[in-house]
């Protein structure tokens, strides 16, 4: 089964190569509407240092795989070789949200991006009814990346001070009532990512219709609106509309609840301060330590690494983890050097899968939880890779 | 090629109005962000109001809510800064600009116009 190209087809996306100041905006279906890319540019890159943008692949030339989408032009590498033309190649994994395309390499004929996205999973599980970009670069070409904060049922109860509403959002996406572990929301409308609740019955105030936007370094605008459809009677004949501000804090602190700002003829400003609002490399780092120098916070988890020994095991339902952090590879898991969490099924011991690599490490601290992740792990079932937090 | 053409601006007393328009040629209107900077003499140039595509996201500036409303004819190809109850330190030069996908890094910029507020 090949990717399903339809939830991504409705935005341009960016990516960004930091080292070669470049920027990319793709849309894998179609033209991304920079007029210097041509009337058919699927991915066009411009270089902000001489301001001059190019199309590095065409979706006149467009190929796919089940997991891979290839966009060619008809532009040589360069001037002295006419055989090798200019493309672009996006290699999807299946995600728990649309998640964002990151650029990995490039060579002089080569463009390659890796896609972590409900779009290339085999089953419908994480897919949302309605989802939209949840990120967004500043100016100094730093990601600020909202995804982790996307709930796949449920929602979060915005604070407020009225008793006899309450108000839950969900972020870049709908709200999944009918796997929301608690029954309050299964009687919101499906589609709604903002959902009042009011005596007994559910209004949608909300729906998403554009990604996120940055208004400045620590500042995120999420907007949802209701347009179609009847408008509750205390709306006073107004559309309703939820507008959600992310703020990165000043300084460390533990999460908070998003806020209601002001409310007026159902339309509801809410404030959410949180890290995640903040960029992603003060967030997180790809070895086991965090520097006081960079994400204002020193951790340090290498103690925990393994030397030599044992791994640590984890007793799971269906499965049993044998965990190396930190890694040491002198101990083998899976009988692979590169496994840093391994699984075995507990009724057949021969089913053994990786469910991480060291190389696939990630360290983030941010609203007062650290989380150590691994991914890259074999393939499930679902068409998702293992990722283990 | 693409041109962003701003008009409107000028001279006002304080507590005067001014319509900015911003007309786009050359690209495809409808699909962009269109937003509205300003930079007053020694400052950085920051987002004043912006527009969403759809119009669905529309956000202002905290010292201008109430006093400004951006609008879009995407028939026109066209955005406007309404300007009321203007203050002198809304002096600056006021630049259009349309982002696909950035507010912070637009694809492209007018030349800009220069709004004084002074009696």
């Known amino acids: 089964q090949a990717v399903d190209l339809d939830a991504l087809c409705s935005y341009t996306w960016e990516a960004v190569d930091s080292k070669n100041n470049a920027v990319y905006k793709i849309n894998v279906c179609g033209n991304v509407g920079i007029s210097s890319c041509g009337p058919t540019s699927a991915i066009c890159m411009c270089d902000l240092k001489t301001e001059n943008c190019r199309s590095v692949g065409d979706s006149l030339l467009r190929s796919s795989a089940r997991s891979l989408l290839e966009f060619n032009t008809t532009m040589g590498c360069q001037p002295s070789d006419s055989q090798h033309r200019i493309q672009t190649s996006i290699t999807f994994l299946c995600g728990k949200t649309l998640g964002t395309p990151e650029f990995v390499t490039a060579t002089d004929c080569v463009h390659y991006f890796e896609w972590r996205t409900t779009a290339a999973c085999k089953k419908d599980i994480f897919k949302a009814d309605k989802e939209v970009p949840c990120y967004a670069f500043d100016d100094k070409l730093q990601k600020h990346d909202l995804n982790p904060l996307i709930k796949l049922n449920g929602g979060y109860l915005v604070d407020d001070s009225d008793p006899d509403t309450s108000l839950f959002i969900n972020v870049c996406r709908d709200i999944d009532s009918l796997r929301d572990p608690s029954t309050q929301l299964r009687v919101c409308p499906a589609g709604t990512a903002a959902c009042l609740l009011k005596g007994n019955q559910a209004f949608d105030v909300g729906r998403p219709k554009e990604g996120l936007k940055l208004l400045s370094k620590d500042r995120l605008v999420l907007t949802y609106v209701k347009e179609e459809g009847e408008k509750p009677d205390f709306c006073n004949g107004h559309s309703p509309a939820v507008t959600v501000t992310f703020v990165c804090p000043s300084e460390r602190r533990e999460g908070t609840i998003p806020k209601l700002t002001a409310k007026s003829n159902c339309r509801y400003e809410v404030e959410w301060i949180t890290e995640y609002a903040c960029h992603r490399d003060y967030l997180q780092s790809e070895s086991c330590s965090l520097s006081s120098e960079q994400h204002d916070i020193t951790i340090d988890l290498s103690p925990l690494a393994q030397y030599g020994g044992s791994p640590y095991v984890s007793d799971g339902r269906e499965y049993t983890f044998f965990i190396n952090v930190c890694g040491d590879t002198k101990v083998s898991l899976c009988n692979n050097k590169e496994a840093a969490v391994c699984q075995e099924k507990k009724a057949d011991s021969t089913q053994v899968k990786i469910a991480g690599r060291h190389q696939n490490q990630t360290l983030r601290y941010s609203d007062g939880d650290l989380t150590l992740i691994y991914s890259g792990g074999d393939e499930c079932s679902s068409g998702h890779h293992h990722h283990h937090h | 090629q693409v041109q962003l053409q701003e008009s409107g601006g000028g001279l006002v007393q304080p507590g005067g109005s001014l319509r900015l328009s911003c007309a786009a040629f050359?690209?495809?209107?409808?699909?962009?962000?269109m937003i509205w900077f300003r930079q007053a003499p020694g400052e950085e140039r920051d987002i004043v109001a912006a527009i969403s595509s759809s119009s669905s996201t529309i956000w202002y500036e905290d010292s201008v809510k109430g006093r400004f409303t951006i609008s879009r004819d995407n028939a026109k190809n066209t955005v406007y800064l309404q300007m009321n109850s203007l203050k002198p330190e809304d002096t600056a030069v006021y630049y259009c600009a349309a982002a696909l996908t950035s507010w912070r890094r637009p694809d492209y910029w007018g030349q800009g116009t220069q709004v004084t507020v002074s009696s």
């Open positions: 050359g690209l495809n209107f409808k699909n962009f962000d």
